[in-house]
Every structure is written in structure tokens, then in C-alpha cells.
């Protein structure tokens, strides 16, 4: 086993140079010192090593820094960043935005989305700010990575980034994430008015509260059914038939095609059938006339 062999006499290198290209893999394992590699990372990148040799160097560095690489080394990683896994990156402490941008440049076009996202998350965790430059450096990676950040990390994301978020970016976000992103979006678009505001905010409405939706229903926004379906059930069921009618405008007719699917079905179950009948759409599933609604959540609290 490579680990057991001792370094042959005279083979211990004092610097990273081309001689190492000609070492056997077991000799690299036995002879190369991780701190030397860390000190001369520029040469590790400059000299044409093989994939296997670079993997050995990575192993040596990991053994030298089991708690994660120091920032002084991370700053020098350059192309060696390609050998680092997202799990490695989660151990790092990165405070320099320049380091992040440099490494993001290295990862571009390398199928390294997971590493890039982990790097930015690690930077945010250390109190860094995700500025628009950094989002641009993340390039073609869909902003769905916002959903991978912890809620604490999300707090560090400036509201201005919300301008760059597209409709599909939030599909996999948890409810908690959506709520936080919605607040940021409200703040980002606060100076935008009318329909333009609605066009921007609708991507984030999955995080809106019932109060927010009520307010929105006063503005003739004519929400499309696709946006309506993305609203959180808890907020939606609190809206009356009249409020939903205002919210959807002419798109109210599309409720019929969705009546047996969540969240429309959940909303219907909470409405009085007589109110639904007034819409003239043939919607079924409301509370029959004369029935009393018991909130079982309250009962459970006392049992």
C-alpha cells in the first residue's frame, strides 16, 4: 500500500518543480509534504501534472488541513479549485470577495455548479455580501441556488439580487426560503409601480401572506392561474371568493380546470358553496349551505 512505503533516500523534494512529474504515484504519496504544496500552489498549477498526480496532491493537502484549507491557501488555489468537492468547501472560511470571484472564474464552464454554490454559501456564512458582481460571476448558474443557501445565508443576500431571479429559479424553494425571498423582493421593487410591480413580484408570491394577497387583490392585477397555483395553501385558504375574484380578474374561469388539484381544491373546501355558485363556473367542493365549519386544529390543541 502506498501509505506504508517510506520515501526513497534523496527523493524528498524541497520545492515543487518538474522533477515531480516523473515520480511514481507511491513516491509522491510518500515524499511530498502538504505544507510545501500549499506554499507553492502557483507552481502546482503551472507545472503540467497528470490528473492522478493532482489527486495525490489534493489528498496530501486534505491530510495537512483536516479542518479545511486556510484562506491563505484558498486564495492561491487557481485551477486546483477544480479538484475540490462541495463537502470540502463547506469546511472553509472565506471572507475575501476577490477570492470568491477568482475561483468562480476558474469554475466557469467546468460543470462545477455545486462547488460554486458551496463557495458563495461559505462566503455568506462568514458575513460576506452577495453583490451583483458575484451573481454575474456565477454566470449561467440558475439562481435556484438561492434555495440551497441556509435561511441565515439568505439574510446576507442584498435585495438588488431579486431583480435577476427568474420564475423557474424558485421552484424547489422551501416555504421558509420563499417567505424570506418575498420580503427581499418587496424591498427591491418598492419603487416600482402598477403592473410592472406585479410582473416583478409574481415570481416571489409563493412567499406572500394572506394579508399581502388581500392587498394585491385591490390592484386589478389579473393574476394568471399558473401564478395562483404557486401561492402557499395557508395564505390562499384565507381569501374569500370575492378576493380571489378580484385577484384573478378575467382569469377566474381557469379555476374550473384546476378544481380537483391543490391548491385550488384546498381553497374550494374552505368556501361556502353558495359563494362559489355566484361565480357561475360550476365549481364544486365548497361547504354546503347551512353547515358549520369546525377548525380541527383548534380542537387538537386542547386534546
Amino acid at each position: 500500500d502506498a501509505e506504508q512505503k517510506a520515501c526513497p533516500p534523496g527523493k524528498e523534494p524541497y520545492k515543487v518543480d518538474e522533477d515531480l512529474i516523473f515520480y511514481q504515484n507511491w513516491e509522491l504519496e510518500a515524499c511530498v509534504d502538504g505544507t510545501m504544496l500549499a506554499r507553492q500552489m502557483d507552481l502546482v498549477n503551472e507545472i503540467p501534472f497528470t490528473y492522478e498526480q493532482l489527486s495525490i496532491f489534493k489528498h496530501k493537502l486534505d491530510k495537512t488541513y483536516p479542518q479545511g484549507y486556510p484562506e491563505s491557501l484558498i486564495q492561491q488555489l487557481g485551477h486546483f479549485f477544480r479538484y475540490v468537492s462541495p463537502e470540502d468547501i463547506h469546511q472553509w472560511n472565506v471572507t475575501s470577495p476577490d477570492t470568491v470571484k477568482t475561483l468562480l472564474k476558474v469554475s466557469k464552464g467546468q460543470k462545477m455548479n455545486a462547488q460554486a454554490i458551496a463557495l458563495v454559501a461559505c462566503y455568506l456564512r462568514g458575513g460576506g455580501q452577495l453583490d451583483e458582481d458575484m451573481v454575474k460571476a456565477l454566470g449561467d448558474i440558475p439562481l435556484s441556488y438561492l434555495c440551497d443557501f441556509s435561511p441565515q445565508d439568505l439574510h446576507s443576500v442584498p435585495s438588488s439580487v431579486m431583480w435577476l431571479v427568474g420564475p423557474q429559479d424558485l421552484d424547489k424553494c422551501s416555504q421558509r426560503h420563499l417567505g424570506l425571498l418575498y420580503q427581499k423582493a418587496c424591498s427591491a421593487f418598492q419603487n416600482v409601480s402598477g403592473l410592472e410591480y406585479f410582473e416583478k413580484i409574481k415570481t416571489f408570491l409563493g412567499g406572500a401572506s394572506v394579508k399581502d394577497l388581500r392587498a394585491l387583490s385591490q390592484h386589478n392585477v389579473s393574476m394568471d392561474i399558473a401564478t395562483f397555483k404557486r401561492l402557499q395553501v395557508d395564505s390562499l385558504v384565507g381569501l374569500s371568493v370575492a378576493e380571489v375574484q378580484k385577484l384573478l380578474g378575467p382569469n377566474i374561469v381557469d379555476l374550473k380546470t384546476e378544481e380537483d388539484k391543490s391548491p385550488v381544491r384546498d381553497w374550494l373546501f374552505r368556501q361556502h358553496q353558495k359563494d362559489l355558485d355566484r361565480l357561475g363556473l360550476g365549481l364544486q367542493g365548497g361547504i354546503p349551505n347551512g353547515y358549520l365549519v369546525l377548525d380541527f386544529n383548534v380542537r387538537e390543541a386542547f386534546s
Epitope: N45, E46, P48, F49, Y51, Q53, L54, H79, F80, R82
Partner: nanobody, 119 residues
């Protein structure tokens, strides 16, 4: 598309010589180093010699020093390896390689040419 095509391999008696050639096409202008690696049956791949195309600096593995010479023809984007005093342990498939500066591992590999040294 980058192509590295090796030629000159074959069977030779121990003590004999061979000249391997590698013709490169499609290499980016920025490439700065070429070389030869070899792999014997059941052994790991190992570097034989490299040459920095910009400076002409050459490096060799210990076991071929004094017996091998790597040289380049910049105009033709080609590199050759002259091997003298061949030994049975030089038997392997020889691969031509090329790389751009600071770009991680060797990016471009040829298909290889077989060298067999019989005793």
C-alpha cells in the same frame, strides 16, 4: 478539434534506437508544453520527457536521462522523442501529450504508439 498523432513505434532489439514523432493539429495557440508519457502492461502511466514550447526547456525521468532527447518543431507544431540504448523495460505504449498554461492536468492525449524492446 485537437488531434495528437504518434508514429515511429515498433519492435527493436535491446541496445537499438527509435525516434517517435507526434504531429499536432487543432492545438490552441496558447499551448505551452508537450511531452511523452508511457504505460507498460500492468504498470501505472509515467512521464518520460516534457518540453516547454515557449522556452525550449526540457525535463526527463531519471531512467531515460542520457538516452532520450525530446525536441520540437514549432513551425509544424510537432514534437519527437529520440530513444537510444533501448532496454526491455522501455517496452510500453508511448503517448504524446500537450497542455495550455495553468490549465490543470494534461488536456490533450494521443492514441499512443507501441514500442517493444526484445532482448
Amino acid at each position: 478539434q485537437v488531434q495528437l498523432v504518434e508514429s515511429g513505434g515498433g519492435t527493436v532489439q535491446a541496445g537499438g534506437s527509435l525516434k517517435l514523432a507526434c504531429a499536432a493539429s487543432g492545438l490552441p495557440r496558447t499551448y505551452n508544453v508537450m511531452g511523452w508519457f508511457r504505460q507498460a502492461p500492468g504498470k501505472e502511466r509515467e512521464g518520460v520527457a516534457i518540453i516547454y514550447t515557449t522556452t525550449g526547456a526540457t525535463y526527463y525521468r531519471d531512467s531515460v536521462k542520457g538516452r532520450a532527447t525530446i525536441s520540437q518543431d514549432n513551425a509544424k507544431k510537432s514534437v519527437s522523442l529520440q530513444m537510444n540504448s533501448l532496454r526491455p523495460e522501455d517496452t510500453a505504449i508511448y503517448y504524446c501529450v500537450a497542455r495550455q498554461p495553468n490549465s490543470g492536468p494534461w488536456e490533450y492525449w494521443g492514441q499512443g504508439t507501441q514500442v517493444t524492446v526484445s532482448s
